[in-house]
Amino acid sequence: IVGGTNSSWGEWPWQVSLQVKLTAQRHLCGGSLIGHQWVLTAAHCFDGLPLQDVWRIYSGILNLSDITKDTPFSQIKEIIIHQNYKVSEGNHDIALIKLQAPLNYTEFQKPICLPSKGDTSTIYTNCWVTGWGFSKEKGEIQNILQKVNIPLVTNEECQKRYQDYKITQRMVCAGYKEGGKDACKGDSGGPLVCKHNGMWRLVGITSWGEGCARREQPGVYTKVAEYMDWILEKTQSSDGKAQMQSPA
């Protein structure tokens, strides 16, 4: 996160760290807890690393430097990458992770509510992006979970800034005209959440941007509302019944 500040314990209890253990262990992506056994993240996090057993998912943590060999983590039972995601295109950048064992909810580890299907009418004015990613383009993973308040921008405005790419209705953009605040490398897959009527909802999944926090280059996020049918289909067919946090 560029231009952010430290988060507090329990402030973003749905935020998880997706880490890979090969020879060393490192944080690669963020994710959002959406049910006892389900994490929503970005498909591109798994490019070149599709093997379930190399991944460790840490939930209920604030500081990555607190992780030791004794820190509990979740393992992956199944990675479900959207069927239309292609490494060569970058659309449909969304994936579900089914955990091997369900998580108990606590003050520091609980799910984020999902938006309604095709939610286009809600005007979100209080949106935040969180993650342990770089604090500048040539930076490093941060120890303490960072947060930053970023306004949504219209898809029309976003398309003007990214004429080389098609900004689809299944994407949502956020950023300041002058730059300075944004997600960055290592924040991929993490949440863009917005508070509406006193409730936090998962509006976007951190996907891509041109650099980080550059002027007139907003961050691009996978629009969760556009994938509600897919999320429900995959979680229900795997579970027998859904255990998602739907909006009230």
């Epitope: 591109h44 490494v87 060569s88 080389d164 790419y165 991929s188 941007g209």
Partner: antibody
Framework: EVQLLESGGGLVQPGGSLRLSCAAS????????MTWVRQAPGKGLEWVSY????????IYADSVKGRFTISRDNSKNTLYLQMNSLRAEDTAVYYC??????????????????WGQGTLVTVSS | DIQMTQSPGTLSLSPGERATLSCRTS???????LAWYQQTPGQAPRLLIY???SRATGIPDRFSGTGYGTDFTLTISRLEPEDYGTYYC?????????FGQGTRVEIK
Amino acid sequence: EVQLLESGGGLVQPGGSLRLSCAASGFTFSHYLMTWVRQAPGKGLEWVSYISPSGGHTIYADSVKGRFTISRDNSKNTLYLQMNSLRAEDTAVYYCARVARGIAARSRTRYFDYWGQGTLVTVSS
Amino acid sequence: DIQMTQSPGTLSLSPGERATLSCRTSQFVNSNYLAWYQQTPGQAPRLLIYGASSRATGIPDRFSGTGYGTDFTLTISRLEPEDYGTYYCQQSSRTPWTFGQGTRVEIK
């Protein structure tokens, strides 16, 4: 399976014209930037031109600007390179390639993930 | 234009040895737009690495890429017989997109 098949190469005199084609299959052609790259005999690779998915945006190397025109027909899944005012230094194997634009570490990427087998253009009197 | 300079021009190594190929650029290149290709005689180039460090589909893990800014490296940890050929770096950060002149890896 992604396939790119170039055709239209051959021997042409200096000042002459040639039209290369690249037939694409195995992917949604209209979603991708496409590019031409050439390689003179015994030399390295030289980028020639690219075209946007819709065909509305084209860019050329200075060495071919004003003489070559890249175009595409998405209904036929075919990429073209119209080469006019050919010179001896245009002699090369011409490759068409698909330009992938995925996402890595929260940024877009750009690279040539599939290439055709090439077609040889010889400009000589 | 961004010039790409590869070194060495030729690398003579035995199977099993480590190959380190360098690519320097005349201006800053966003590493997401830096790729490496392999070409063997009579064949079209083949993508090895994209985004400076991501291996393309089907590329063995003995190939790795690193670098940032103006200095990029392709490493082949243990040369196999099929690895001999010419390697090119390429940037598509700014037009005109440009290739390095190539490094030829030959059998010692």
